[in-house]
Interface confidence: low
């Protein structure tokens, strides 16, 4: 499955939307900062391509959950967040035609299951420190920057399968 | 007032070992992102090793890989750098210097610097 | 690893001039580039985190730009205090690597 080049370019509109978003000084937020163990391992190199999908799928779906809440409406500009949403829903349905091509559906389902499962509790760990820290910007600011880092590294790893096609 | 202060200056023969200390104020280390960066004499920077937020991921350079570990006491708020198996090129000041950014994969910029200490690995 | 490559490694300037000092990544780092001014016998200081946000308390002639491979840090008009020595890291990956550095001394 060739994934297109628009969905490339809207990984890098993503980024750029995120970084829009920020309100505040992460240097002014030192005390909420949180090692919240993203699993760079599950998006490493070694993976085939059938591998990845279902894995960047669910990282993209869990962002998306992660900013449709009411309480992250509340947090963001809303024109931005309308802009984030479209480019995600973009990205989730190219995914979704690779996996409706076959692609991601038949190799090792145990690998991916168990990288999904890391994906989804690291998006937990994002959930449960929003609520410890009753949603204040600072929290917000630091999940902002969290999931530009780790949503960059996601982006590199479906760049580097372009790359080896 | 946000502070980062490195344990005196050492000198060390090839072979030996060193514990460098740094001791943080107005900021806990246990909740930010750590790093060690040293400058040998007239040279420029070099990344040498970090611990996240957690404590529960380390890295190291390849240079370091095997001799040198990054540990802290969050009792003490201490950040600490034990360095075994000392050799000439070792011989620098080391900084231990605090992140901006959040967790154990992101950070975007060394923003809290110690004074530096100088070892120097000599016979 | 990742390369980080500066250039021009020295550079002669004047107060009040335009100055423009390059990092080039040996393979994409998105954004995570940043930027320090070192003056000797000091611990160096951040200017810029994230390739173009300005650190608290740097003054507003510093600026960065650039993604991926290429980025530059601009000194809009040199001041005397300007006089240092840059660089650049990335933090996208570990090991976090500098640049060799780009001495900047008065003409």
């Known amino acids: 499955c060739d994934l297109p080049q628009t969905h490339s370019l809207g990984s890098r509109r993503t980024l750029m939307l995120l970084a829009q978003m920020r309100r505040i000084s992460l240097f002014s937020c030192l005390k909420d900062r949180h090692d919240f163990g993203f699993p760079q391992e599950e998006f490493g190199n070694q993976f085939q391509k059938a591998e990845t999908i279902p894995v960047l799928h669910e990282m993209i779906q869990q962002i998306f959950n992660l900013f449709s809440t009411k309480d992250s409406s509340a947090a963001w500009d809303e024109t931005l967040l309308d802009k984030f949403y479209t480019e995600l829903y973009q990205q989730l349905n190219d995914l979704e035609a690779c996996v409706i091509q076959g692609v991601g559906v038949t190799e090792t389902p145990l690998m991916k299951e168990d990288s999904i499962l890391a994906v989804r509790k690291y998006f937990q760990r994002i959930t449960l420190y929003l609520k410890e820290k009753k949603y204040s910007p600072c929290a917000w600011e630091v999940v902002r920057a969290e999931i530009m880092r780790s949503f960059s590294l996601s982006t590199n790893l479906q760049e580097s399968l372009r790359s080896k096609e | 007032e946000v502070q980062l202060l490195e344990s005196g200056a050492e000198v060390k023969k090839p072979g030996g070992s060193l514990r460098l200390s740094c001791a943080a104020s107005?900021?806990?280390?246990?909740?930010?992102?750590m790093s060690w960066v040293r400058q040998a004499p007239g040279k420029g920077l070099e990344w040498v090793s970090a611990?996240?937020?957690?404590?529960?991921?380390?890295y190291y350079a390849d240079f370091v890989k095997g001799r040198f570990t990054i540990s802290r006491d969050n009792s003490k708020n201490t950040l600490y750098l034990q360095m075994n198996s000392l050799r000439a090129e070792d011989t620098a000041v080391y900084y231990c210097v605090s992140s901006v950014g959040a967790g154990a994969y992101y950070y975007q910029g060394l923003d809290v610097w110690g004074q530096g200490t100088l070892v120097t690995v000599s016979s | 690893d990742i390369q980080m490559t500066q250039s021009p490694s020295s550079l002669s300037a004047s107060v009040g001039d335009r100055v423009t000092i390059t990092c080039r990544a040996s393979q994409g780092v998105g954004n995570f580039l940043a930027w320090y001014q070192q003056k000797p016998g000091k611990a160096p200081k951040l200017l810029i985190y994230?390739?173009?946000t300005l650190q608290s308390g740097v003054p507003s002639r510093f600026s960065g730009s650039g993604s991926g491979t290429d980025f530059t840090l601009t000194i809009s008009s040199l001041q005397p205090e300007d006089f240092a020595t840059y660089y650049c890291?990335?933090?996208?990956?570990?090991?976090?690597?500098f640049g060799g550095g780009t001495k900047l001394e008065i003409k």
């Open positions: 994230g390739a173009s």
């Open positions: 611990i996240s937020g957690s404590g529960g991921s380390t």
């Open positions: 107005g900021f806990t280390v246990s909740s930010n992102y």
């Open positions: 890291q990335q933090s996208y990956s570990t090991p976090f690597t």
